[in-house]
Amino acid sequence: ALDAAYCFRNVQDNCCLRPLYIDFKRDLGWKWIHEPKGYNANFCAGACPYLWSSDTQHSRVLSLYNTINPEASASPCCVSQDLEPLTILYYIGKTPKIEQLSNMIVKSCKCS
Amino acid sequence: ALDAAYCFRNVQDNCCLRPLYIDFKRDLGWKWIHEPKGYNANFCAGACPYLWSSDTQHSRVLSLYNTINPEASASPCCVSQDLEPLTILYYIGKTPKIEQLSNMIVKSCKCS
């Protein structure tokens, strides 16, 4: 799996999970989230060469098509696979609210 | 939806469905598929600017992050959303086989 256990230990040009810490205030301009101040969002990036973690029949076909026809612009792309939620604390007026935001943290990637 | 109805009628630099006909023999080097000779596989390509068809909370956050930090390399990518199967005819020896191949045709795209 193209997850932290694999990607953060290997220097990888191909599609892999990349570390990305997002500071809500500095990076997004969001002041409304009280806690946490930021989080490890991560992201997916890298090349998708022939059969590198292709996730569907179409991406495998496209991968082969792109290999045999290197001048073609139709190639798979490195995107998130597994995502996890993030729990945040914010205020409405003086009332604290705890919310779980779904699909905020990328845990693994794929070529699709 | 970033499907044929929208994308094939509009000149679109942003993430959209692109037409791609694949001839099995010419483009993939596959002789084993008897029918059809090829099919409209399509593919997804184009830029993913702020909120352009973002499909998850993470891709929306990444989209905003990328807008506020344009020097960053962390941006969403244009990939397939809905896929459909393709029915093929091939032979094992002299025995004809009909098979439905899942996820062979891209019908719509998203920024992920």
Partner: nanobody
Framework: EVQVVESGGAAVQPGESLRLSCAAS????????MGWFRQAPGKQREMVAI???????NYADSVKGRFTISRDATKNTVYLQMNSLNPGDTAVYYC????????????WGQGTQVTVSS
């Protein structure tokens, strides 16, 4: 059970040749796109060459003109003829089979070691 088995790896000197073989189960061979990949220590696995059932081939830039991939349907075997070997070719070489019938799968062999050193 589908099997992909490589053989032919060895230790050779720079400039020498070697031929790797890969035998695949007959049930998949006729429809499979066969490939050779390699992985050197501390590096990512990379494609070396592929060959389709129709004989279309593609090679990594680093091996073009030196390596030749071929397949023999009568023996369900794919070969990689490697000429003018150099130390940069040292790696574990893996054979794989991409199939989409009877199901979509990528089958990998266990690998065979090729060492090029003087």
């Amino acid at each position: 059970e589908v099997q992909v088995v490589e053989s032919g790896g060895a230790a050779v000197q720079p400039g020498e040749s070697l031929r790797l073989s890969c035998a695949a189960s007959g049930s998949i061979f006729n429809t499979a796109t066969m490939g050779w990949f390699r992985q050197a220590p501390g590096k990512q696995r990379e494609m070396v060459a592929i060959i389709t059932d129709g004989g279309r081939t593609n090679y990594a830039d680093s091996v073009k003109g030196r390596f030749t991939i071929s397949r023999d349907a009568t023996k369900n075997t794919v070969y990689l003829q490697m000429n003018s070997l150099n130390p940069g070719d040292t790696a574990v070489y893996y054979c794989n089979a991409l199939t989409i019938v009877p199901r979509s799968s990528i089958y990998w062999g266990q690998g065979t070691q090729v060492t090029v050193s003087s």
